[in-house]
């Protein structure tokens, strides 16, 4: 029998489908499951992130039974992907401890409003970043990032929560926006697309790159997640896209090469301590920033996102990686885990150098029609 | 630490029953496929049954089938080979491992010796 | 089912010097869904076998950058650039494209 590309009737997985099927339709994402850069920002459109309060954007919720961390990061919800992907009509043991945000996924049923109210607001992300509408903010000083270099122990966990991998990042990562606005780094995780489709979530002018980094971070005026949800700057995103690039990128490659042992939703494993600024762009000085929302449910808003005006390199085979190892819910590969752009709806995106004359993802005219709201700071 | 010791191996005439168990820790054991694997001594490797996630596909070699019963118990994170009919050509260190979606088997056990002799 | 046949059965390697298995399938691995599934493992003396590669080229987490797997269709190759003590073991090639799932015979690879 040729094998199902299903764990669940091949050895190469696990998931539940026909006996002898080969490659089951559930394996690869339908068109009308993956966001498409065309579509309206409609509700239906709002793909989200990952696992926490839902938003993969958030830190993930660690069991009861596991110590309690300095930001009491276990009592938020542990939001889980719905059901077991190898029995997805037995899914009464799970979600004990989750609530209605873990019942979401990209595409499709249910629409994110009725996961969360927030889904549906008017300030949400992400955005299509237009260099030349930005407004150039001088007061938008380098951002500065301490004990981001983590020596190998103690290790990190990896998972593969069912909508992206998030590394669980350690206390003691301190990043300051700007004087006063002061964060703690909480986890990092992914968001990319499928074979020939890129799947960033910010895009630059319309154009897609074919991954982003996001690293989140909690205000250090709230000691938990729960407290700074939905309040203005209580959370903040560090976003960075990742493109082709001609050599293997050695710090990914830390993380990628173990993606295969996490290849299953809701696995994970442990990762020896790494430099995480090396996952992150060099040139700290040049970047967007906006005040948007988490790109999955719960969406709250308020989250102060900061896009690098660079990218990160990547190997084609390491994006390869990237995009094809890890496996969803349902028996489905986890791939085009991005929400759509959402309307800026009067929002002004502000950028830390004049854009609107290099910009760089993305050239464009040298015009300069907002100004910076952070001027007078 | 991810870990697959294997138990209940021994001694037993032709014709005779052993169950073999295999358990799984360190890892989320209900999400992964699993095989079984002997190798007779001084020979090499030879699959002998595969189980999903969810049970719902099994797979035997033929050299097996109809006397080889493989089952796993995800509440108790324990993997199962019900072994009958033994006969001598079924002599050999018993390995369960895990399968990954690349088709690899990264994990496996130490093994357990099953030795049919009369 | 598909045979799988390793060469040499035994290689004789001085340390430093590389190394090199051939692997054969019966028929084509390729599997309807794109992927090629033939990994490699390494049985060192008295230990369980141990995945080196997967799906042809891709080193399994923690595998030195010495081992390297090529090939494509039925024709497959695992080299190791510069033998070191701790690679003398028996090396096995597997095929999990199709049931029943087959490994290679073997070939052992030892110090000169």
């Known amino acids: 029998q040729r094998l199902p590309r299903m764990q669940e009737d091949s050895p190469l997985g696990g998931g539940s489908s026909g006996e002898d099927d080969p490659l089951g339709e559930e394996d690869l994402p339908s068109e009308e499951d993956s966001p498409r850069e065309e579509d309206p920002p409609g509700e239906e459109d709002l793909p989200g992130e990952e696992d926490l309060p839902g938003e993969e954007d958030l830190p993930e919720v660690k069991p009861k039974s596991e110590e309690e961390g300095s930001l009491k990061l276990e009592d938020l919800p542990t939001v889980e992907a719905p059901g077991d992907p190898q029995e997805p009509q037995n899914n009464a043991h799970r979600d004990k401890e989750g609530d209605d945000q873990s019942h979401w996924r990209y595409g499709g049923d249910p629409p994110w409003p009725r996961v969360s109210p927030a889904c549906a607001g008017r300030f949400q992300s992400p955005v299509d970043i237009r260099p030349q509408l930005a407004a150039f903010c001088p007061a938008l000083r380098p951002l500065e990032l301490l004990g981001f270099q983590l020596p190998p122990l103690p290790e990190l966990r990896l998972r593969n929560n069912g909508h992206s991998v998030q590394l669980t990042l350690p206390p003691g990562l301190e990043m300051a926006l700007g004087p006063g606005r002061e964060y703690r780094a909480l986890q990092l995780h992914l968001h990319w697309g499928a074979a020939g489709r890129p799947g960033s979530e910010h895009t630059v002018e319309g154009h897609r790159f074919p991954a982003e980094i996001h690293v989140v971070h909690l205000s250090t005026a709230f000691a938990r997640v729960d407290e700074a949800l939905g309040r203005p700057g209580g959370l903040a995103v560090l976003a960075a896209f990742l493109e082709e690039g001609p050599e293997e990128n050695s710090a990914y490659e830390q993380l990628l090469s173990r993606l295969e042992e996490i290849a299953e939703e809701g696995s994970e494993t442990q990762v020896p301590g790494l430099d995480i600024s090396a996952l992150l762009p060099s040139d700290f000085s040049r970047y967007f920033q906006y005040e948007g929302s988490l790109t999955t449910p719960p969406c709250a808003q308020g989250v102060i996102w900061t896009v690098f005006n660079q990218t990160v390199m990547l190997s084609a085979k390491q994006l390869h990686t990237l995009s094809d190892t890890l496996w969803g819910p349902g028996d489905s590969r986890l791939q085009l885990n991005f929400r759509a752009t959402q309307p800026l709806n009067g929002r002004v995106i502000e950028a830390s150098f004049p854009a609107g004359v290099d910009s760089s993802p993305r050239a464009a005219e040298p015009v300069q029609l907002n100004s910076c709201l952070a001027a007078g700071d | 630490r991810v870990q697959l010791v294997e138990s209940g191996g021994g001694l037993v005439q032709p014709g005779g029953s052993l169950r073999l168990s295999c358990a799984a820790s360190g890892f989320t054991f209900s999400r992964y496929s699993m095989n079984w694997v002997r190798q007779a001594p001084g020979k090499g490797l030879e699959w002998v049954s595969y189980?999903?996630?969810?049970?719902?596909?099994?797979y035997y070699a033929d050299s097996v089938k109809g006397r080889f019963t493989i089952s796993r118990d995800s509440a108790k994170n324990s993997l199962y080979l019900q072994m009958n009919s033994l006969r001598d050509e079924d002599t050999a260190v018993y390995y369960c491992?895990?399968?990954?979606?690349?088709?690899?088997?990264?994990?496996w056990g130490q093994g357990t010796t099953v030795t049919v002799s009369s | 089912d598909i045979v799988m046949t390793q060469t040499p059965l035994s290689s004789p390697v001085t340390l430093g010097q590389p190394a090199s298995i051939s692997c054969r399938a019966s028929q084509s691995l390729v599997h309807s869904d794109g992927n090629t599934y033939l990994s490699w493992l390494q049985q060192r003396p008295g230990q369980p076998p141990r995945l080196l590669i997967y799906k042809i080229s891709n080193r399994f987490s923690g595998v030195p950058d010495r081992f390297s797997g090529s090939g494509a269709g039925t024709d497959f190759t695992l080299k190791i650039s510069r033998v070191e003590a701790e690679d003398v073991g028996v090396y096995y090639c597997m095929q999990a494209t199709q049931f029943p799932l087959t490994f290679g015979g073997g070939t052992k690879v030892e110090i000169k």
């Open positions: 491992a895990r399968s990954l979606r690349s088709g690899g088997m990264d994990v």
């Open positions: 189980i999903s996630s969810s049970s719902s596909t099994i």
